[in-house]
Interface confidence: low
């Protein structure tokens, strides 16, 4: 039997820095968990304490803090180099920078191979991006070799931005010819690595012949085989065994997001390459494990250029943006507007003839918005003034709602009106109106939506049964403010980009920014 | 609405132990973390310790490091206190808090007990 | 540990007036644009009433006489036209680093 230890990570979302338990800013050393320098720690510990083990990375290194803003990648490239990665997968968020933003920083830059079989480039990008990422790596382990297979979630085209020239194939179909081809290599231990959610990730344990381990993303899912350490709870044991067509256990894992856990799975392979036996679990990283001295002075002088980042300018704006609980709880303000119009302009997608865009809608929390900017500052916008507004360090995801949600949702923003709490929602493409003197669960007089499937964007009123692309706050995703039933009910649900990057992006784009107070929620007459 | 109610006062003679209770509602009680903080007759406050409810982490003030034990029930949603080897500067009203924000990262006490006071006297 | 000292010990005032009290921390409590410094009021029999948070943040439900501001190590909380309810010790408090501590108090009397 050959023993193989298979540590891994996955949507670290450049949490390069120690991070508080909810991976939000660290303030409180002790408290703190996770960090590169705290990874490099423990990966090393077990380096040298067992024979054959591999370090992966699921994808979604990209996106997530100010570290990705300003250094665009390379600083992924620098520190898993540091910590000798010796694979990665690409994740839909590598693209959010376009393939310049995935090529230059990183695939030119990463000393280990990044992988997509599923990724199939054409047209003049064909040459371009020939062997800089690959469909499955031959590694050495010991006496032994492994072979890794990577897959990226198909839904990328609509998820980030990897334009034109890259076709993002079915997963299963892709992984099985990858897979028969290391066969008549004679490489007999597979791994897939890959960022398609633990569904897709299971899907594939179960479906492609001759993957023995399979190591996911994307869902940020949280496995665990006792009493969790931390406030994560498990979705399922780990590893979470799925039993093959064929007739085989494979070990599915994942090791949740953000760098807190490093994922720690021990394999025992026979002389077939069969697996006979699964066991670990993911480690916490919390501040019982010390950050590496090298590592962490490296980290350090890499923040330099963030601190000189927040104080620059990204924009301007000529009017003073009502980003105060007094307006955005009880009302429409134009600060929610704002943010709102950048979250649908960073989701915009025209991947299909019939569709100007494959979404229309926005809503906000009035109660995530933390501060107003004033103008008369020279109308000057900083990294640090969108960091007083959007203080929290979410998400702007994408989630798919059936209409009678929306509609619930819209009860739920005003079923105690007027005591200023924070689910008043903020919107985008969509126009509503609330009759407050009505009962609450029953304001909701008229709720109009934006159409995609039209060249000429119109509101049209919303249908309950229907199924709506909706961009949101994690917040929301996740039934904060009581918004239970967007959690219970949303049929999919993907992680976006960080809150305060969206914003700065299209203000930066805009240049000069004057948004308004337009009507976008309205009180019908005598309750308001 | 949010609550914290804590047992009742308590008199006890200096060597023994004594354990406060609080019971919360009203929010998700494994999300956010209680403080435990006291104050004696006419002082200030002070902060002894805290614990997460989810994941049991716990923090302790060093000066009580090794007299204070503090445990949460997530099954009731209440969280102990208890101080043991007990003597007469011991006597204050103690309370728990909850740690607020949309980010733990802020960590202001933003509900408190109404306090429980404990007398050590022999 | 960090040691809050705040300032005046009492402070006696008309109604109408402005208070200005002072919390100052031995070492700095601000990092990253964000300041872990929060201000309480309690009165006596009472447990102690969240005021203030991150520094400048109003909690909800307090009338907005109350305002926080500083950065750094040097904190104040004013209340303008301070009305006879206001009577009260005042505390801060910082979450900078474990452990937490409290300063001493401002006791504010009104006339």
């Known amino acids: 039997a050959w023993e193989l230890t298979i540590l891994h990570t996955n949507d670290v979302h450049s949490r390069l820095e120690q991070t508080s338990e909810d991976s939000s800013k660290c303030v409180n050393a002790s408290r703190c968990m996770g960090g590169v320098a705290r990874l490099f720690t423990k990966v090393q510990q077990i380096r040298r304490a067992e024979p054959n083990v591999l370090l992966l990375d699921a994808g979604d290194q990209y996106q997530g803090t100010i570290w990705f803003t300003v250094y665009k990648g390379a600083e992924v490239a620098h520190f898993m180099n540091a910590l000798r990665y010796d694979a990665m997968a690409l994740g839909n968020h590598e693209f959010d920078n376009g393939v310049e933003g995935l090529i230059e920083p990183l695939l030119k830059e990463a000393k280990f191979p990044i992988l997509s079989a599923n990724i199939k480039a054409k047209g003049p990008l064909a040459s371009q991006i020939s062997g800089l990422y690959l469909p499955y790596k031959v590694l050495p382990v010991g006496d032994e070799v492994v072979g890794i297979v990577g897959y990226t979630s198909k839904e990328t085209p609509f998820l980030s931005n990897p334009g034109t020239n890259l076709v993002f194939e079915d997963e299963i179909t892709a992984l099985q010819p990858e897979v028969d081809k290391l066969k008549t290599l004679n490489v007999n231990k597979i791994i897939a690595l890959g960022h398609s959610g633990f569904e897709m990730d299971k899907l594939i344990a179960q479906k492609v012949r001759g993957v023995d381990v399979v190591v996911g993303g994307h869902s940020n899912t949280f496995l665990y085989t006792g009493n969790p350490p931390s406030k994560e709870v498990p979705a399922g044991k780990y590893p979470f065994i799925v039993t093959s067509d064929d007739g085989r256990k494979v070990p599915v894992v994942q090791a949740y997001a953000f760098g807190k856990y490093l994922g720690y799975l021990k394999i025992e392979f026979d002389e077939r390459g069969n697996v006979i036996s699964s066991h670990g679990n993911p480690i916490l990283l919390n501040s019982s494990i010390p950050e590496d001295p090298s590592i962490k002075a490296d980290i350090n002088k890499w923040r330099i250029k963030l601190d000189n980042y927040s104080t620059q300018e990204l924009g301007k704006t000529i009017v003073y943006l009502d980003g105060s609980s007094q307006s955005c709880r009880f009302r429409e303000c134009n600060m929610g507007n704002l943010i709102c119009d950048a979250m649908i302009n960073n989701n915009l997608r025209h991947t299909d003839e019939m569709f100007w865009n494959h979404v229309s809608m926005c809503i906000l929390n009035g109660g995530g918005i933390r501060s107003p900017i004033d103008e008369r500052n020279n109308g000057t916008i900083t990294w640090e003034n969108l960091a007083a507004v959007l203080p929290f360090g979410g998400t702007f995801d994408l989630v798919q709602l059936k209409g009678s949600t929306l509609k619930k949702a819209f009860e739920h923003s005003v079923h105690r009106y007027g005591q200023s709490t924070g689910e008043f929602l903020q919107v985008g493409g969509i126009h509503v109106v609330y009759d407050l003197s009505r009962k609450p669960g029953d304001r909701v007089v008229k709720l109009d939506v934006l159409c995609t499937k039209c060249r000429v964007p119109s509101y049209d009123p919303l249908k309950m049964d229907e199924v709506y692309k909706v961009i949101l706050p994690n917040f929301l995703a996740n039934g904060g403010d009581g918004f239970q039933m967007i959690k219970d009910e949303l049929l999919r649900h993907d992680s976006g980009d960080q809150d305060i990057n969206v914003v700065s992006t299209y203000i930066s784009k805009m240049k000069v920014i004057y948004p308004a107070v337009e009507g976008r929620i309205k009180f019908s007459t005598g309750s308001h | 609405q949010v609550q914290l109610v804590q047992s009742g006062a308590e008199v006890e003679k200096p060597g023994a132990s004594v354990k406060v209770s609080c019971k919360a509602s009203g929010y998700t009680f494994t999300s956010y973390w209680i403080t435990w903080v006291r104050q004696a007759p006419g002082q200030g406050l002070e902060w002894m310790g805290d614990i997460y409810p989810g994941s049991g982490n716990t923090n302790y003030n060093e000066k009580f490091k090794t007299r204070v034990t503090i445990t949460a029930d997530k099954s009731t949603s209440t969280a102990y206190m208890e101080l043991s080897s007990l003597r007469s500067e011991d006597t204050a009203v103690y309370y728990c808090a909850k740690e607020g924000g949309l980010t733990t990262e802020d960590y202001a006490l933003d509900y408190w007990g109404q306090g429980t006071l404990v007398t050590v006297s022999s | 540990e960090i040691v809050l000292t705040q300032s005046p010990a009492t402070l006696s005032l008309s109604p109408g007036e402005r208070a200005t009290l002072s919390c100052r921390a031995s070492?700095?409590?601000?990092?990253?644009?964000?300041?872990?410094m929060h201000w309480y009021q309690q009165k006596p029999g009472q447990a102690p009433r969240l005021l203030i948070y991150l520094a400048s943040n109003l909690e909800s439900g307090i009338p907005p006489r109350f305002s926080g501001s500083g950065y750094g190590t040097d904190f104040t909380l004013t209340i303008n036209n301070i009305e006879s309810e206001d009577a009260a010790y005042y505390f801060c408090q910082h979450s900078r680093e474990l452990p937490f501590t409290f300063g001493q108090g401002t006791k504010v009397e009104i006339k």
């Open positions: 070492k700095q409590v601000s990092t990253s644009g964000y300041s872990y």
